[in-house]
């Protein structure tokens, strides 16, 4: 045995985003002939030894970080990634608007505005079709998601959702969907982004998504463009996490 | 009530073999993950060995690994460990201890404790 | 050497405040894993006394807190009486070989 044993996966099927009262599963998902699976979920740290988890109704309970590791004889594995399994639907949906219109000339800029009725520092953006998500607070209870140069790409359907950073994984249900339409002519080829540009994280490095410049409420946005090279539709938004008031 | 109740310590020459049991009741015993806990004379806390509920989890320290076996017999509420090629450092009262569970999860840490067996490994 | 690490002893007199700590690693406490506190009378077996870093089992006093940070951990005890003389061991989960780890154990005296 040189070195530790490769990590496995950990998948939550359907989804990792589970609204309350469905089911979901964990799997971990390791080598072949492992002798014993373990699946942890963390805060408070308890786990089964089984290479899966079903969770036939999601309660709020079911909500948290999870990892898995295996072991063959009397070695363990790495830990899997961390899966965030997220309950949805604890609280009322938020309202999704776009501004100045959802129908927007290519080249133009659009502000996806998410508001919460509640007093709710965290919000999140998905695309339809995307696995990846944009996350940032906002501290007036809003979020502006700034989308500059808009491109084809950009069209689809939209969500957000909204939470608080003191219960991570308690999510809204999700608002009713915004469908963002890209008109005009396509215009020249967009620039490439750079990894000096970029914030490579995990999600990043999956095909159809493109991550995002960290943006603050006193920052200038960067451009967010499409890229032609490596990047098949739909364009979606890289999973970025960031503390209130950053 | 809970009890754990340890048995079978002794004197033992060294590279000899000792056999020490824990009789389980008060609770459900094939339900729960079960640890062998050691402590030499005036020393602290040492895990020694964990089986899990239906017994084919099993994990070692690696002080005593190929040396300690553990075991169980949900039929008959015992937990077992066979020491064998024992080691002057292998002197130490011997603890089984539950680790607490709560619905279908295991915990990592223990709930309750026996009372200890002495094992004493001297020429 | 234990992989947690605590002061070998600590004292006190009644009434007063004393503060035990316990240091770990990136492999069990900084992890993520939670710290457990169990206390030792002498001659007798050990007893969960804190649990999942500051919990109390029912029939411990809140005189005994628990608390968990980064890599380390620390016990309270406040209004120190003569039967909190005893060794207190922590404990904690290594992820690297999933075993259970324990401090070394400290030796509470109270003193007068």
């Known amino acids: 045995q040189s070195g530790p044993l490769p990590k496995p996966s950990l998948q939550a099927q359907p989804s990792s985003l589970v609204p309350l009262g469905q089911s979901v599963i964990l799997r971990c998902q390791g080598p072949p002939d492992v002798d014993l699976y373990r699946l942890e979920k963390l805060k408070p740290e308890k786990y089964e030894d089984q290479d899966f988890l079903f969770i036939p109704t999601m309660e709020r309970s079911n909500a948290g970080r999870y990892r898995c590791s295996y072991q063959n004889g009397s070695h363990w594995s790495l830990p899997s990634d961390q899966l965030e399994l997220i309950a949805t639907g604890v609280y009322a949906k938020p309202s999704l608007s776009a501004h100045p219109s959802s129908a927007v000339p290519q080249g133009r800029d659009v502000t996806l505005k998410c508001q919460s009725p509640y007093s709710f520092d965290e919000f999140v953006l998905y695309k339809e079709g995307d696995t990846g998500s944009y996350k940032r607070p906002e501290k007036w209870y809003r979020a502006n998601f700034p989308i500059i140069t808009v491109t084809a790409a950009h069209s689809g359907t939209y969500r957000c959702y909204s939470f608080s950073s003191s219960s991570p994984y308690l999510w809204s249900a999700p608002s009713d969907p915004l469908v963002l339409v890209v008109t005009g002519l396509s215009a020249t080829p967009s620039q490439v982004p750079t990894e000096e540009s970029f914030p490579v994280t995990e999600s990043s490095r999956r095909p159809s998504i493109l991550p995002t410049n960290k943006i603050s409420t006193t920052e200038k946005p960067m451009n967010i463009t499409a890229s032609p090279e490596g990047l098949s539709p739909p364009f979606g938004f890289a999973h970025q996490h960031y503390a209130k008031g950053n | 009530q809970v009890q754990l109740v340890e048995s079978g310590g002794g004197l033992v020459k060294p590279g000899g073999s000792l056999r020490l049991s824990c009789a389980a009741s008060?609770?459900?015993?094939?339900?729960?993950?079960v640890s062998w806990i050691r402590q030499a004379p005036g020393k602290g806390l040492e895990w020694v060995s964990a089986?899990?509920?239906?017994?084919?989890?099993?994990q070692y320290a690696e002080s005593v690994k190929g040396r300690f076996t553990i075991s169980r017999d949900n039929a008959k509420n015992s937990l077992y460990l066979q020491m064998n090629s024992l080691r002057a450092e292998d002197t130490a009262v011997y603890y089984c201890?539950?680790?607490?569970?709560?619905?279908?999860?295991?915990?990592?840490?223990?709930?309750?404790w026996g009372q200890g067996t002495l094992v004493t490994v001297s020429s | 050497q234990s992989v947690l690490t605590q002061p070998p002893s600590v004292s006190g007199a009644p009434g007063q405040r004393v503060t035990i700590s316990c240091t770990g690693s990136?492999?069990?406490?900084?992890?993520?894993?939670?710290v457990h506190w169990y206390q030792q009378l002498p001659g007798t077996a050990p007893k969960l006394l804190i649990y999942?870093?500051?919990n109390r089992p029912s029939g411990v006093p809140d005189r005994f807190s628990g608390s968990k940070s980064g890599t380390s951990a620390s016990l309270a005890i406040t209004g120190l009486q003569a039967e909190d003389e005893a060794d207190y061991y922590c404990?904690?989960?290594?992820?690297?070989?999933?075993?259970?780890?324990f401090g070394g154990g400290t030796k509470l005296t109270v003193l007068g």
């Open positions: 999942g870093n500051s």
């Open positions: 404990q904690s989960h290594d992820l690297g070989a999933h075993v259970w780890v």
């Open positions: 008060g609770f459900s015993f094939g339900d729960y993950y």
């Open positions: 201890a539950r680790h607490y569970r709560e619905f279908r999860w295991h915990y990592y840490y223990f709930d309750y």
């Open positions: 990136s492999s069990n406490i900084g992890a993520g894993y939670d």
């Open positions: 089986i899990g509920g239906s017994g084919s989890a099993v």
